[in-house]
Amino acid sequence: EAIQVTQPSVVLASSHGVASFPCEYSPSHNTDEVRVTVLRQTNDQMTEVCATTFTEKNTVGFLDYPFCSGTFNESRVNLTIQGLRAVDTGLYLCKVELMYPPPYFVGMGNGTQIYVIDPEPCPDSD
Amino acid sequence: EAIQVTQPSVVLASSHGVASFPCEYSPSHNTDEVRVTVLRQTNDQMTEVCATTFTEKNTVGFLDYPFCSGTFNESRVNLTIQGLRAVDTGLYLCKVELMYPPPYFVGMGNGTQIYVIDPEPCPDSD
């Protein structure tokens, strides 16, 4: 039995290079540990951007990753990626694993296309 | 016999609010006048953004429209929309009409999703 993972198809990063989007899964299971991984797809290659494990007590994740943050609530993770630049424009996939207790479930979203535009530099102040 | 109009599926506006994209049609006909209309689709409604008629002599268009400009070369129009803000994010369709001489042909592209991010204001200089 697979879980369905849904995420928005498109997100625009702010002018500060911050993109936020939800990653939800269903059906909701009574799970002690949920692992969420953000992957970037370029051509046929997947690169891990960041990963974290959420628990009932630990609902704030990605503490080891300076570019990612996230909060967990029931079957929804609110993901934020920061420090993005135009070269980071691409498809970001959310992978969800229900780690414990068994049975183990895994699901992958179709990806969120994140568009990033580099801001123009502000003029120097005289 | 219809003409096929092609345009990119996605374009990002620059931080200055400028989006440029090509609109091409085929097959190419020996046409004295080609009318190009840019439409914005919101829900089921189409709104005309700008329109112009290109001729062999008049290859620069949209002179009456402050937000649009375009150049025509054979069966390709290079469109530029400026003054865009985040609220203008949406689907922009290119409509091409071969106006004269007959036969009249018309075609519509599938639309270009233009994403616009408002820039952060620069800090006041002291």
């Epitope: - | 016999e1 219809a2 004295d32 006048e33 008629t53 001729t55 008049n58 409509k95 009409e97 106006m99 004269y100 001489p101 007959p102 036969p103 009249y104 042909f105 018309v106 075609g107």
Partner: antibody, heavy 124, light 107 residues
Framework: EVQLVESGGGLVQPGGSLRLSCAAS????????MHWVRQAPGKGLEWVSG????????SYADSVKGRFTISRDNSKNTLYLQMNSLRAEDTAVYYC?????????????????WGQGTLVTVSS | DIQMTQSPSSLSASVGDRVTITCQAS??????LNWYQQKPGKAPKLLIY???NLETGVPSRFSGSGSGTDFTFTISSLQPEDIATYYC?????????FGQGTKVEIK
């Protein structure tokens, strides 16, 4: 009601000139390509000249090229045909006709509205 | 220019008869063939466009068929008000050209 009304026909000597007018109503004239089609007595239909909606492009049948000039005044919803160096073989009923351009149809190739015609007779 | 040849040039039929007119193009014009009706002293009127499409308001006894170079126009049951000259017109290549016309009379 969509309507086209021609005027300006009459009797003229060979080598003379005449100007035909066609007043349009009931549709967006400036968006419509307009044409002149003639019919000699007891004969068939012959396309003569056409003009684009903007007035920027024109075309002529070989038989009238260099002698006839088509024009339009979109502010007056009127089509014109200036006929110079007229010949006996130009004798005909001259019809103005609208060439239909419809987005729904993708391609069109017919005249959907015609005026009642005006007779031009070239004779000495 | 594309030449259009219509036949017959004239015909006489009785009320209720089926009437058929043919039109041949000098080259392939796909389905870009239109038919007009012209009553004496009147302007032409579009009846059929693109070979087989009936113009709005035209009675269903009129029909058209064909593609390529050979086309047919049919009046399924001739009525007195159908006395007129019928013209075909090609719309494939500019300039448009017309057939020489077929005059339809009642016996």
């Amino acid at each position: 009601e969509v309507q086209l009304v021609e005027s300006g026909g009459g009797l003229v000597q060979p080598g003379g000139s005449l100007r035909l007018s066609c007043a349009a109503s009931g549709f967006t004239f400036s968006s419509s390509s307009m044409h002149w089609v003639r019919q000699a007595p007891g004969k068939g239909l012959e396309w003569v000249s056409g003009i684009s909606g903007s007035g920027g492009s024109t075309s002529y049948a070989d038989s009238v090229k260099g002698r006839f000039t088509i024009s339009r005044d979109n502010s007056k919803n009127t089509l014109y045909l200036q006929m110079n160096s007229l010949r006996a073989e130009d004798t005909a009923v001259y019809y103005c006709a609208r060439y239909l351009m419809s987005f729904n149809l993708v391609r069109t190739s017919w005249f959907d509205v015609w005026g009642q015609g005006t007779l031009v007779t070239v004779s000495s | 220019d594309i030449q259009m040849t219509q036949s017959p040039s004239s015909l006489s039929a009785s009320v209720g008869d089926r009437v058929t007119i043919t039109c041949q193009a000098s080259q392939d014009i796909s389905n870009y063939l239109n038919w007009y009706q012209q009553k004496p002293g009147k302007a032409p009127k579009l009846l059929i466009y693109d070979a087989s499409n009936l113009e709005t308001g035209v009675p269903s006894r009129f029909s058209g068929s064909g593609s390529g170079t050979d086309f047919t126009f049919t009046i399924s049951s001739l009525q007195p008000e159908d006395i007129a000259t019928y013209y075909c017109q090609q719309g494939d290549a500019w300039p448009w050209t017309f057939g020489q016309g077929t005059k339809v009379e009642i016996k």
